[in-house]
Interface confidence: low
């Protein structure tokens, strides 16, 4: 029986996906205006021509750099937050702590946040049926190697004391096959960057436990170390109270550990 | 069909105060950023405000910054402009225009303007 | 503020013939590759009309003869044949920096 669409494994491109990228790139040269230079519509031209007409299994880092270019922007290095399995937490963080920057903080990365998108060899058709898994179909596909080059290159701009934060709840807090553990570890230049400082987020109200002791946080330790960068580790026992107290630094509570 | 009518202009004495308003249609009002530019009598034009779609970003000119107040209701469809402290020189056609769509700071639509008039 | 200053004031040019305007910033209004320099359209008793973006880009449903060209500081919009619904004010913006400024307006008129 031929089939006139490949089926993949994952969920298909988000609905109305081009819609959203152009909307979210106005908003953002609007909020933005140190960006105002971008011009949205290329910028979605640019993202279009990375993976429409193009084997969504097929796809490279070099199908995005004409979006790269187009989305080049300056955070400054030294206030780069990154992390692992704990994104809504860490944009919480980034959005009171205003002058530091998550990859979601930054255009690229706001554009894409949360969205799936492919297309089909040989067709201008964005598939919104299914997009290829990364385990069960390919991990050549649009969406992860778009995350792969943002992160790469977002990791690669970090200088001095870069902060990672980490789910405590999770049996790997540290996992060398997350984007955080298979790309921005090994992208971060030890010429630049001093000191990597890990915050392990706990999750159980009573959960005094000392994770920085965990193994995987002390295999994070020594493949940092190898490459020549200080580690340091911080436990995040109360993030409400953490929230909190970035939010309001004088109040007589935070001074004591949180 | 895209459309921007002003209203709210008039006259009114130096150190008064004047709401504008600008009622948008045709298009999907809360995802453009919108502006209120004037133009003395017989003179050229003056950006004077902008609000971004949410309304977490607002930029003025100096010259009117703590006097006058943009702000917009997106569920009404609807851009103001808040005037104190009036002066002689705030005399002129206020227009709204619509942020072009792909990027900060120029202007596709405009409305037809209304003239606020100073004196006393 | 950047200033702009355009020129000449007015002009008056015969039907059919070719009508330069020129504008010039106070200081660049380039930035990573793009000139955010923008010329607008303004009749009597109407609100101005988008006619250039980015300084070479014409703006959908605007006649051909329109095109614009410079970059940095000095910019120019050209009428190829000038006709007579083409009388009106015209002025540059930028929008590089804020305040977002407008040039003084050139008009032009039937010789």
């Known amino acids: 029986v031929p089939r006139w669409r490949q089926q993949w494994s994952g969920p298909g491109t988000t609905k109305r996906f081009p819609e959203t990228v152009l909307a979210r790139c106005v908003k953002y040269t609007e909020i933005h205006p140190e960006m105002r230079h971008v011009d949205c519509q290329s910028v979605w031209d640019a993202f279009k021509g990375a993976f429409i007409s193009k084997h969504p299994c097929n796809i490279t880092e070099e199908d995005y750099q004409p979006l790269m270019k187009l989305g080049t922007q300056t955070v400054p290095c030294n206030k780069i937050l990154l992390w692992s399995r704990i994104k809504d937490l860490a944009h919480q963080f980034t959005q009171v702590q205003r002058d530091m920057f998550t990859l979601e903080d930054t255009l690229l990365g706001y554009l894409a946040d949360d969205l799936t998108w492919c297309g089909e060899f040989n067709t201008s058709k964005i598939n919104y049926q299914s997009c290829p898994d990364w385990r069960k179909d390919c991990s050549n596909n649009p969406v992860s190697v778009f995350w792969k080059t943002v992160s790469r290159r977002f990791a690669e701009a970090a200088c001095d004391v870069v902060h990672v934060m980490l789910n405590g709840s999770r049996s790997k807090i540290f996992d060398k096959n997350s984007t955080f553990g298979s790309v921005e570890v090994h992208n971060l230049q030890p010429e630049k960057v001093q000191t990597l400082e890990a915050w392990v987020i706990h999750g159980g109200r009573e959960d005094s436990r000392d994770l920085c002791q965990d193994p995987t946080i002390k295999e994070l330790e020594s493949i940092i170390s190898k490459r020549n960068i200080q580690f340091s580790c911080k436990n995040i026992y109360r993030p409400d109270k953490f929230l909190q107290c970035v939010k309001n630094p004088e109040d007589s509570s935070c001074t004591s550990e949180i | 069909e895209v459309q921007l009518v002003e209203s709210g202009g008039g006259l009114v004495q130096p150190g008064g105060s004047l709401r504008l308003s600008c009622a948008a249609s045709?298009?999907?009002?809360?995802?453009?950023?919108m502006h209120w530019v004037r133009q003395a009598p017989g003179k050229g034009l003056e950006w004077i405000a902008f609000?971004?779609?949410?309304?977490?970003?607002?930029y003025y000119v100096d010259k009117v910054k703590g006097r006058f107040t943009i702000s917009r209701d997106n569920a009404k469809n609807t851009l103001y402009l808040q005037m104190t402290s009036l002066r002689a020189e705030d005399t002129a056609v206020y227009y709204c225009a619509r942020n072009y769509v792909s990027s900060y700071g120029y202007f596709d639509y405009w409305g037809q303007g209304t003239t606020v008039t100073v004196s006393s | 503020d950047i200033v702009l200053t355009q020129s000449p004031a007015s002009l008056a040019v015969s039907l059919g013939e070719r009508a330069t305007i020129s504008c010039r910033a106070s200081e660049s209004v380039d930035n990573y590759g793009i000139s955010f320099m923008h010329w607008y359209q303004q009749k009597p008793g109407q609100p101005p009309k988008l006619l250039i973006y980015r300084a070479s880009n014409l703006e959908s449903g605007i006649p051909a003869r329109f095109s614009g060209s410079g970059s940095r500081t000095d910019f120019t919009l050209t009428i190829s044949s000038l006709q007579a619904e083409d009388v009106a004010v015209y002025y540059c913006q930028q929008t590089n920096k804020d305040p977002l400024t407008f040039g003084g307006g050139t008009k032009v008129e039937i010789k």
């Open positions: 609000i971004s779609t949410g309304s977490s970003n607002i």
């Open positions: 045709g298009f999907t009002f809360s995802d453009y950023g």
